[in-house]
C-alpha cells in the first residue's frame, strides 16, 4: 500500500477553480435582505449555499447551484453531459468503501459494486476516496444510473469529502449537506 492507499492526492490536490473570483470568500454584503445564493468554496471544492444581504458582496455569488457549478468547477459541464447521455459509470464508483482515518461521524453513501446499489456508510472525515457521496440521490445519479438523469444533480463529482466537518466556513453558511449527526 502507498502512503495514502487510494492516491487521493492526485485526484483532489490539483483542483484549480476556473476563475479567480471563484476563490473569493462568500460575502453577504452590508445589506439586510435574506437572499438564498450560492458560492464556490475553495476548501471543499463545492458550490454551497449562503445567505446574501442583497447589495455589494463579490463575484463569487450565483442565483442557482447549477450556474455556480458551471462557472467554477473545472470540467463540470463535460461530466454532467457525459453522465446524462448514458455514458459509462466513472471508475471511482468501483472503489471499495474507505471511511478514512479521522474521528468525524458523517453519514455518507457509496456505490456497492456487489449489490449494484448505493448504500449508506459512515465517513470519518479525512482521506478516503471518491466513492463517497453526501446524498443517496447524488450517488444514484453518478454511479447507480449514470445515464438515467438530467445530469443537473451531479453534485461535484470531484469529491469534496476531505473535510472532517465543515462548520468553520464562511459567514451565513447554511449548506445542509454537512450537518448530519
Amino acid at each position: 500500500l502507498s502512503e495514502e492507499a487510494d492516491d487521493t492526492d492526485s485526484e483532489l490536490g490539483s483542483m484549480k477553480p476556473l476563475h479567480t473570483f471563484c476563490a473569493m470568500k462568500a460575502d453577504d454584503g452590508p445589506c439586510k435582505a435574506m437572499i438564498r445564493s450560492y458560492f464556490f468554496n475553495m476548501y471543499t471544492h463545492q458550490c454551497e449555499e449562503f445567505i446574501y444581504g442583497g447589495c455589494e458582496g463579490n463575484e463569487n455569488r450565483f442565483d442557482t447551484l447549477e450556474e455556480c457549478k458551471k462557472t467554477c468547477i473545472p470540467g463540470y459541464e463535460k461530466t454532467a453531459v457525459k453522465a446524462a447521455s448514458g455514458a459509462e459509470r466513472p471508475d471511482f464508483c468501483f472503489l471499495e468503501e474507505d471511511p478514512g482515518l479521522c474521528r468525524g461521524y458523517m453519514k455518507r453513501y457509496l456505490y456497492n459494486n456487489q449489490t449494484k446499489q448505493c448504500e449508506r456508510f459512515v465517513y470519518g472525515g479525512c482521506l478516503g476516496n471518491r466513492n463517497n457521496f453526501e446524498t443517496l440521490d447524488e450517488c444514484k445519479k453518478i454511479c447507480e444510473n449514470p445515464g438515467g438523469g438530467s445530469g443537473g444533480g451531479l453534485n461535484d463529482i470531484f469529491e469534496a469529502q476531505k473535510i472532517e466537518w465543515h462548520e468553520g466556513g464562511p459567514p451565513h453558511h447554511h449548506h445542509h449537506h454537512h450537518h448530519h449527526h
Partner: antibody, heavy 116, light 111 residues
Framework: EVQLVESGGGSVQPGRSLRLSCAVS????????MQWVRQRPGKGLEWVSG????????GYADSVKGRLTISRDNAKNSLYLQIDSLRADDTALYYC?????????WGQGTLVTVSS | QSVLTQPPSVSGTPGQRVTISCSGS????????VHWYQHVPGTAPKLLIY???HRPSGVPDRFSGSKSGTSGSLAISGLRSEDEADYYC???????????FGTGTKVTVLG
Amino acid sequence: EVQLVESGGGSVQPGRSLRLSCAVSGLTIDNYAMQWVRQRPGKGLEWVSGISGNSRSIGYADSVKGRLTISRDNAKNSLYLQIDSLRADDTALYYCAIFLHESDYWGQGTLVTVSS
Amino acid sequence: QSVLTQPPSVSGTPGQRVTISCSGSTSNIGTMYVHWYQHVPGTAPKLLIYRNNHRPSGVPDRFSGSKSGTSGSLAISGLRSEDEADYYCLAWDDTLRAYVFGTGTKVTVLG
C-alpha cells in the same frame, strides 16, 4: 474493559529497524481507525501515523514519511508500526490509540531508545 | 515545528478560570474540528473535548471548548490542583494530510 498494550520498544542502534505492536482486547478493531502518537523526551505529543479500519486510508507525518510503515491485522486485533533507519530523534515513548467518534482509547506506551 | 500554536504556559490560583488558545489556519482548524487533550507525561493522554465543544462522558463540565475562525480555545473554570498537566489541541490538517497536535501548554495551579 478495553485495553491497548504496546510492545516491541527497547534500546537499539541508529540505522537499525524496529517493529512496534499494539494488542487490543475488549474491543473488535475492524471498524475503527487507529493511530500512533509519540512523545520525545522533553517535547510535546506528535502524531506519527494513522490507518483506517480496512487499511485503505493511511497517513504519515511529514517528519517520518518513507521510514515508517503502519499496518494492522484485524484477525489478531493488533496494530503495528515498522520503523526503519532509526535515528536518535526517534527516541520517544510511542503510544497507540483508537480515536472513536466520542471517546478515545490509549495504551500506556512503549519506550524506544536509539543510541550507539 | 507544529502548525498549531499554543501558549507555552498558563497559571492560576484554585477556583480561577484559565483559557488556552490554539491558533491554526484554514487548512486545519478553519475547516476541521479541534480536539483537546490533558496529558501527564509518562501516562496516556486523556481526551477532554472532541469536535470543538463536546465533552466525553466522565469529563467535568469545568472544561469547555470553543472554536472561532482558525482558532480553538479550551477553558478551565474552577481551577483545581489536579488540573496541573500539559494540554494539547489536535486537528486534521488537510494540506499536510496529517493530524497535528498543538505545541502544548503547561497549566500550573499556584498556591
